[in-house]
């Protein structure tokens, strides 16, 4: 069967919009369908429609198409907002320019080049002709509009109403003449939808024929509408992915506007005395590099040849020999007049200390009002107003809406680990932003670390499974396998979630890992009845510097006599010094004939100050770390134990209070172990479990 062409690229999309007919005489056709693509194909082919389809609305809620013989420019029609609707208008009917010879032109120009009114196509007066609408179906020979049904050289034409002039071409400009851009077109938001060789552009919201990362919802500021040419990545000019499977992308032919001025929104903040950000908007007159060597003129090729000319970088103000940053370097620079020194930075220009350029936060960042809008993994933040429902789901007070503007990184839920944002990516609903605490900010996020202010245990008794107390059971221990070998430990804290260490994932390919649960022997010998082997579906990295990972299992573990979860401590709690705790692991034991059985080492909690003294003052512990020393000299965690838990008991309840991470040596005599303090990250763990989707059992 021949593959039907996807025609949705021929439509202009207006999200959350529908058309309401004021004129009751206007017809509409509706039908249940699955996708907007199906609506588009039917509209383009006019299949089974009693009119020429000019637009359609896809009702996402009812999965329904509404086809129209009119569009938003027609009389007797008005646009209306509607969450569940997307309006698609055939571009041919709303364009006021032509592509190539204008064969597809379906606009409403009806006057010839010399100003004569066109004769209607259905009329034989004053000129008889054979161009009847019935003979040229699909060519839209409507009214007296200019058309080019045969794709002739001169472009759209018509028979004229002047008996002396049989026909004449119409003066409809080429789209490439109408469309123009400033600079390299990063701010271009025009309607050019084909490349310089005439290939039709692929829609930005489609992944066929070419998969790409420029998803409109990920980059709300890039103007990824329909399939129009754009320049999201600093190319020399706008481009698009093409519908040709063999040509991934091509530039578009968009000329530079005669009046090459930029909109206010495109201009980096202009400064003359200091540098804002990377200094792309610096327009001052400093003309030497940091050590006093004079700059070469931008329009000169001596002593250094270059392409950073005023002609090539029209909007970058490359006047005289002033320091500038036309290419997104770290700061303003110039070519130098010293033949031996090609370029130099003008780092003597001071930085503007402007508060809205904040790139650090104080405390936990709940008052951060900077304008960063990207997560630490590079995802563009999604608008706060689209995510209020999700936000209300995990906070129990009304967030300050005045702070939640645009898609800027914020901290509306008092997260201990700084500003964050929603992403619009269903796999990573939210993430932290790459902002650090301001230098010298000592505001603690948890107070009184070494004094038991908050109890770690929830006030409930030990859990019982099938009537058997699990106090001696270690069913929450997980063996993380890398390429079929044990690599690390972990703790099952929820049926689908394992808490472990970041360093346990040398490969980014999740197919390399498995989680073994319910085992006592590292090789699973004798554990066949109780062993559960689960794949890993996602890694969620902890806050910056935490060394933690929450590992999502591909399906939930089945809790039974051999597999159980372990409790988390209360956020910010402290456990009294000398509390007896244990570390568990299948790691290096120092024995040559290691039997592969799960080992336990008994430790006791030590205050951070005393711990630092035991490390001869070389280590300063912070609020995110917890210390425990061995009762037996030289016992403690080592290679293969990383990711595993430090388990303590309070009020007869066992909890994972620490996670074993590398970097503090293996069970060194008289040196207590330093672990990641789980209580410090407890809110983060709960927030992930609450907001990330998990498969149902």
């Amino acid at each position: 069967q021949r593959k039907r062409r996807n025609t949705i690229h021929e439509f202009k999309k207006s999200a959350k919009t529908t058309l309401i007919k004021i004129d009751p005489a206007l017809k509409i056709k509706t039908k249940k369908v699955n996708t907007a693509d199906q609506c588009a194909n039917r509209c383009t082919r006019n299949k089974g429609l009693p009119f020429t389809c000019k637009a359609f609305v896809f009702d996402k809620a009812r999965k329904q198409c509404l086809w129209f013989p009119f569009n938003s420019m027609s009389s007797g029609v008005k646009k209306e907002f509607g969450h569940e609707f997307d309006l698609y208008e055939n571009k041919d009917y709303i364009r006021n320019c032509i592509i190539g010879k204008g064969r597809s032109y379906k606009g409403t120009v009806s006057i010839t080049k010399s100003g004569i009114k066109c004769q209607p196509w259905s009329s034989m007066i004053p000129h008889e002709h054979s161009f009847l609408p019935s003979s040229y179906r699909g060519k839209d020979l409507q009214e007296n509009y200019c058309r080019n049904p045969r794709g002739e050289e001169g472009g759209p034409w018509c028979f004229t109403s002047n008996p002396e002039v049989r026909y004449e071409v119409c003066d409809i400009p080429q789209c490439s003449e109408v469309e123009c851009m400033t600079c390299n077109g990063e701010s271009y938001r025009g309607l050019m939808d084909h490349t310089e060789s005439g290939k039709i552009c692929q829609r930005w919201d489609h992944q066929t024929p070419h998969r790409h990362k420029f998803l409109p919802e990920r980059y709300p500021d890039k103007g990824f509408d329909d399939n129009y040419c754009r320049n999201p990545d600093g190319q020399p000019r706008p481009w698009c992915y093409t519908l040709d499977p063999h040509t991934r992308w091509e530039y578009c032919a968009i000329k530079t506007c005669a009046d090459n001025t930029m909109n206010d929104t495109d201009v980096p903040l202009e400064t003359t005395e200091c540098i804002q950000g990377q200094g792309e908007g610096y327009r001052g007159t400093v003309n030497t590099i940091w050590n006093g060597i004079p700059c070469q003129r931008w329009d000169s090729q001596y002593p250094h040849e270059h392409d950073m000319t005023p002609e090539n970088f029209k909007c970058k103000d490359l006047r005289e020999n002033y320091c500038r940053n036309p290419d997104g370097s770290e700061s303003p620079w110039c070519f130098t007049t010293d033949p031996n020194i090609r370029v130099g930075y003008c780092s003597q220009i001071p930085n503007c200390d402007m508060s809205h350029g904040q790139d650090c936060y104080r405390g936990n960042g709940k008052n951060y009002m900077g304008n960063l809008s990207q997560t630490r993994s590079g995802l563009t933040c999604s608008m706060w107003d689209k995510n209020m429902e999700d936000l209300h789901r995990h906070i129990f007070w009304e967030p300050d809406a005045s702070k939640l503007n645009e898609n800027y990184c914020r901290n509306p839920d008092d997260d201990a680990h700084g500003p964050w944002c929603y992403t619009g990516n269903p796999l990573i609903p939210w993430d932290y932003c790459p902002i650090s605490r301001c230098e010298g900010d000592t505001t603690p996020t948890i107070v009184n670390l070494d004094h038991p202010v908050i109890s770690c245990a929830k006030t409930k008794q030990l859990r019982v499974v099938n009537g058997i107390p699990t106090r001696t059971n270690i069913g929450w221990m997980v063996s993380l396998r890398y390429r079929n070998k044990h690599i690390c430990g972990g703790s099952l804290i929820k049926e689908s979630w394992v808490l472990t260490a970041r360093q346990c994932f040398p490969s980014r390919d999740l197919k390399d890992y498995e989680a073994w649960l319910g085992i006592h022997d590292v090789h699973g010998r004798g554990d066949e009845k109780c062993k559960q082997v689960l794949n890993v579906s996602q890694l969620v990295y902890g806050p910056e510097g935490s060394d933690l990972v929450l590992m999502k299992l591909a399906r939930p573990a089945v809790l039974d006599d051999f597999v159980s979860t372990i409790d988390l401590p209360n956020y910010g709690c402290t456990i009294p010094e000398k509390t007896s705790c244990s570390v568990y692991g299948w790691g290096y034991t120092g024995l040559i004939n290691y039997d592969g059985l799960l080992r336990v080492a008994h430790l006791y909690i030590m205050g951070n100050e005393k711990c630092s003294q035991h490390h001869r003052g070389k280590v300063t512990l912070n609020e995110s770390e917890i210390c425990a020393g061995a009762e037996k000299i030289g016992s403690g965690p080592c290679e293969g134990d990383y990711g595993g838990p430090l388990v303590c008991e309070q009020h007869k309840m066992r909890m994972v209070l620490g996670v074993i991470v590398p970097g503090r040596g293996c069970a060194i005599p008289n040196r207590p172990g330093i672990f990641v303090r789980v209580a410090y990250y407890a809110k983060w763990i709960h927030k992930i479990i609450l907001t990330y989707k998990v498969p149902q059992s």
């Epitope: 390429r483 970041r502 980014r508 290096y588 590398p662």
Partner: antibody, heavy 119, light 110 residues
Framework: EVQLVESGGGLVQPGGSLRLSCAAS????????MSWVRQAPGKGLEWVAV???????DYASSAKGRFTISRDNSKNTLYLQMNSLRAEDTAVYYC?????????????WGQGTLVTVSS | DIQMTQSPSTLSASVGDRVTITCQAS??????LAWYQQKPGKAPKLLIY???KLASGVPSRFSGSGSGTEFTLTISSLQPDDFATYYC????????????FGGGTKVEIK
Amino acid sequence: EVQLVESGGGLVQPGGSLRLSCAASGFTVSAYAMSWVRQAPGKGLEWVAVIYVIGATDYASSAKGRFTISRDNSKNTLYLQMNSLRAEDTAVYYCARVYDSVWNHFNLWGQGTLVTVSS
Amino acid sequence: DIQMTQSPSTLSASVGDRVTITCQASQSISSWLAWYQQKPGKAPKLLIYQASKLASGVPSRFSGSGSGTEFTLTISSLQPDDFATYYCQQAYSVSNVDNAFGGGTKVEIK
């Protein structure tokens, strides 16, 4: 100064063994994943082996079973033990620091040591 | 296992030219790709990491792009110092891998 210095290269007969060392200064080898990369005369770069912070290792198929990567934290040194050497193992061997504790790009290289396998 | 294919293997260009080198991964590696420059007798030097991030001290004429399986290293205006061999390297996974590097592209004077 942060640097890596390789040693232990030289001429060895086919089937013979050699141990390369890489002494690190200015940082701790156990805090980073560390790797060996080689380059045969006139050829491209070929990754050989890596040891991660947690002690796990990975090898290129050409090195598996014959080469062993290890480190001595007390000496701040990385090693590559090469057994059953073949003529095709002739190359400059570079020691390289991985940017992270897990697999990633290399942000520090040694100057290289030449290993020649020939009878 | 992941294979890295670089093209072209040799490229002749003149000072001032815009030069583009491509690297293809046999499976998606997201943005986990690095580019290195190597001159004869020297160790490689990191230029770009995570597909598009410029390593410190690297001139801004070098840029990287791409994600998934297709990646590009661009030198906007070739300088005399840029004649060298360039390698891509996947930073995604080395479990069961023959080589993490591409075959290299030698940029020589036209």
